[in-house]
Interface confidence: low
């Protein structure tokens, strides 16, 4: 028997369901009584789900996994993982044994989009050209860690005097805070882009300083 899985990682959004595809080519006359199917975590060998002795032995992994019982006889050994969490990320191995055995590993990449950044200024009044200001760009509840880019109104990257911190919450999702320290010109726009590298999702925020007062562009 030869096991086949997707070469590319399965990307799943947090709190959605994911299918880890695994298939084999059953010989004519194959019956489920001959099948031993085991899903396990590749690195730790922890049992995730199994089908042995002609029946589904159920989930051994926080009761969030399921097989596709009606499709097993056709060679579909895929695993459904419900309500995906950050901690589910990693490699899963599908073992199929009929008379001989084979196995293959599939990777699960978990992702969560970042929120539209909120922008804050300090100080936020009595601003004059030549003043040093601190602009903070905050985006929340994303995964994995973000890439943050700053640009001025002409689209020129701002790389100096930028400090970015990312903190994971109890669910493993990241809150991003990026601080730009800049000397004000007569006026100017400063934009922050928070990119999720897995989803290729960009979240934009900007602030425009035109002497007085400050304006925050509406959400697009």
């Amino acid at each position: 028997v030869e096991v086949q899985v997707s070469e590319d990682p399965v990307v799943a959004l947090v709190d959605t369901d994911a299918t880890l595809r695994c298939s084999f080519s059953p010989e004519p006359g194959f019956s489920l009584a001959q099948l031993n199917l085991i899903w396990q975590l590749t690195d730790t060998k922890q049992l995730v789900h199994s089908f042995t002795e002609g029946r589904d032995q159920g989930s051994a992994y926080s009761n969030r996994t399921a097989l596709f019982p009606d499709l097993l006889v056709q060679g579909n050994a895929s695993l459904r993982l419900q309500r995906v969490r950050v901690t589910d990320e990693g490699s899963y191995t599908c073992f199929v044994s009929i008379q001989d055995f084979d196995s293959a590993a599939v990777s699960l990449q978990v992702a969560a989009p970042y929120s539209k950044p909120s922008m804050t200024l300090e100080p936020n009044k009595d601003l004059r050209p030549g003043n040093m200001v601190t602009i903070t760009c905050s985006s929340y509840q994303g995964y994995p860690e973000a890439e943050v880019f700053w640009k001025d109104g002409q689209g020129v990257p701002l790389t100096g005097n930028v400090t970015t911190s990312q903190m994971a919450n109890e669910r493993g999702l990241f809150d991003v805070h990026s601080v730009l320290r800049v000397v004000l010109g007569a006026n100017g726009t400063y934009s922050c882009l928070v990119r999720n590298p897995v989803l290729q999702q960009d979240a934009h925020g900007s602030v425009t300083i035109t002497g007085q007062p400050l304006t925050f562009p509406p959400e697009a």
Epitope: E2, Q4, S6, D8
Partner: antibody
Framework: EVQLLESGGGLVQPGGSLRLSCAAS????????MSWVRQAPGKGLEWVSG????????YYADSVKGRFTISRDNSKNTLYLQMNSLRAEDTAVYYC?????????WGQGTLVTVSS | QSVLTQPPSASGTPGQRVTISCTGS????????VTWYQQLPGTAPKLLIY???HRPSGVPDRFSGSKSGTSASLAISGLRSEDEADYYC???????????FGGGTKLTVLG
Amino acid sequence: EVQLLESGGGLVQPGGSLRLSCAASGFTFSSYGMSWVRQAPGKGLEWVSGIYSGGSSKYYADSVKGRFTISRDNSKNTLYLQMNSLRAEDTAVYYCAKNRLRFDYWGQGTLVTVSS
Amino acid sequence: QSVLTQPPSASGTPGQRVTISCTGSSSNIGSNSVTWYQQLPGTAPKLLIYSDSHRPSGVPDRFSGSKSGTSASLAISGLRSEDEADYYCGTWDASLNAYVFGGGTKLTVLG
């Protein structure tokens, strides 16, 4: 009876290209991964490339990555190996083999000679 | 230099038992099943042993395979002159994302 028949080999100059074909019969071609394995004159076996049954996922040996492309046409029961930028060290008998992780049937091979 | 290491040659007289070793690492033999191939002179390779120790139909039970840790072995008992051939081990290497072969062992049947 499973049969694999390679074709497309021959003499080619360094830097040239060749396309090998492997016609399969006697099994459900679309259900199985397929592979190419080569053997230089007087040398051992060297795996070249493998492809999943549907054709979406492909693997290559480092020595051919970026130069060779494996593909398949399940409607024609045929496996292909497009070889570009050929080098003298690519000279070998090229075998088509059934499966991706265990080569249970092999063709008789086609000889590729790269020489000026 | 092959990823899997085999002795370049082995020999025995008819009726003897010979063993061919294949040594790898945790990323290949240690984590995937081993296959053995026989290549008779002037012919294409043939599947001899799969999944470490299983024989396809048509392969005599004089051929047997085993695996322990990161090494595998092919044993041929009751050696015959028609067993004179090159023998290769092979498996998938998870680190290289590639199938790897041993360098091959040339078996000579003496006398």
